[in-house]
């Protein structure tokens, strides 16, 4: 686990767990409806997404000399998108069936999340940008673009902690 | 089965607040959103508004702002509408219900503003 | 605001006959890019509370009879009930949840004759 003091995550656990939201955020992203995308435009919610840039420490040599920042980073955009999947997008009409991998991927994202971050140990997080209801009509589109930015963070994410388990677990 | 159950009617006097609820059994509480509707005898229905009981998220039509204070629970899976300052105009059937294209209603609570 | 009109605002008939009930949107609810419209239409017997017949304009609830039908798209929608039964005499109201507010028609009231 990433607790203070800089010690070590649970690599492997990380792992797992990032390859697991992976093939969620896959599965998720058909079902969200059929979209004909020469509609899409620039939509407020979805701008400012989490993007895990060169100098957040990701790369095999920042992870050796403090993989803190990285890690900060990837809980920060964990935050952000575990707050998007409970908002209105994902639970307003249209209605995602009961069984829908949006429900399983969002347990994921606060379980990971919970892994780098245990009680009593706080990251500063990223501002969370204060969601204004969605219209409905706008769900399918941003759904659409939400899910499938996660899967580009979730990607990198991913290879960071498959990294950090082959090179960095004691 | 999903089933939303609603508290039962109320009588109040002008200028008093009251606070209905709306119990969800048979889904993941979380999962959808409750909205509130109104109903005066003999008449339509007016959307109040909703809440996202994951976030507590609220949406209100603008004509109820100021009126109603919708707030949930999920420990106990339950949605409340608070309506303040009531008057005769506030007496109505109150309906909670889910999503649309899901389409679960409560059975309403009557509220009756009477001095 | 959506607004939403419903007709006729009555409609007396006679058991077994076909029905068919209008509402008009005061603008578009189809969303092109996912061929949906937000309409739905609900059933008030007197007494209760309202029931989800139809929703995306066409869709029947599971439990739904099939002799209910909802058609349309836009701003035309109608309501079609293929041989009604003593059973239906309810209020019938189609709304909207393409935007906020939400809002609903009028109704339309189904009277035996």
């Known amino acids: 686990r990433a607790v203070p003091g800089g010690s070590s995550p649970a690599w492997t656990q990380c792992q797992q767990l990032s390859q697991k939201l992976c093939t969620l955020a896959w599965s998720a992203h058909p079902l969200v409806g059929h979209m004909d995308l020469r509609e899409e435009g620039d939509e407020e919610t979805t701008n400012d997404v989490p993007h895990i840039q060169c100098g957040d420490g990701c790369d095999p040599q920042g992870l050796r000399d403090n993989s803190q920042f990285c890690l900060q980073r990837i809980h920060q955009g964990l935050i952000f998108y575990e707050k998007l999947l409970g908002s209105d997008i994902f639970t307003g009409e249209p209605s995602l069936l009961p069984d829908s991998p949006v429900g399983q991927l969002h347990a994921s994202l606060l379980g990971l999340s919970q892994l780098l971050q245990p009680e009593g140990h706080h990251w500063e997080t990223q501002q969370i940008p204060s969601l204004s209801p969605s219209q409905p009509w706008q769900r399918l589109l941003l759904r659409f673009k939400i899910l499938r930015s996660l899967q580009a963070f979730v990607a990198v994410a991913a290879r960071v902690f498959a990294h950090g388990a082959a090179t960095l677990s004691p | 089965e999903v089933q939303l159950q609603q508290s039962g009617p109320e009588l109040v006097k002008p200028g008093a607040s009251v606070r209905m609820s709306c119990k969800a059994s048979g889904y993941t509480f979380t999962s959808y959103l409750i909205h509130w509707v109104k109903q005066k005898p003999g008449q339509g229905l007016e959307w109040i508004g909703y809440i996202n009981p994951y976030n507590d998220g609220t949406n209100y039509n603008e004509n109820f702002k100021g009126k109603a204070t919708l707030t949930s629970d999920k420990s106990s899976s339950t949605a409340y509408m608070e309506l303040s300052s009531l008057t005769s105009e506030d007496s109505a059937v109150y309906y909670c219900?889910?999503?649309?294209?899901?389409?679960?209603w409560g059975q309403g609570t009557t509220l009756t503003v009477s001095s | 605001d959506i607004v939403m009109s419903q007709s006729p605002s009555s409609l007396p008939v006679s058991v077994g006959e076909k029905v068919t009930m209008s509402c008009k949107s005061s603008?578009?609810?189809?969303?092109?890019?996912?061929?949906?419209?937000?309409l739905a239409w609900s059933q008030q017997k007197p007494g209760q509370s309202p029931k989800l017949l139809i929703y995306?304009?066409?869709t029947r609830k599971s439990g739904v009879p099939d002799r209910f039908t909802g058609s349309g798209s836009g701003t035309d929608f109608t309501l079609t009930i293929s041989s009604v039964k003593a059973e239906d005499l309810a209020v019938y109201y189609c709304?909207?949840?393409?935007?906020?507010?939400?809002?609903f028609g009028s109704g339309t009231k189904l009277e035996i004759k």
């Open positions: 995306w304009a066409s």
């Open positions: 219900a889910s999503n649309w294209d899901v389409g679960y």
């Open positions: 603008q578009s609810l189809l969303y092109s890019s996912s061929q949906k419209n937000y």
């Open positions: 709304h909207q949840y393409y935007s906020y507010p939400f809002t």
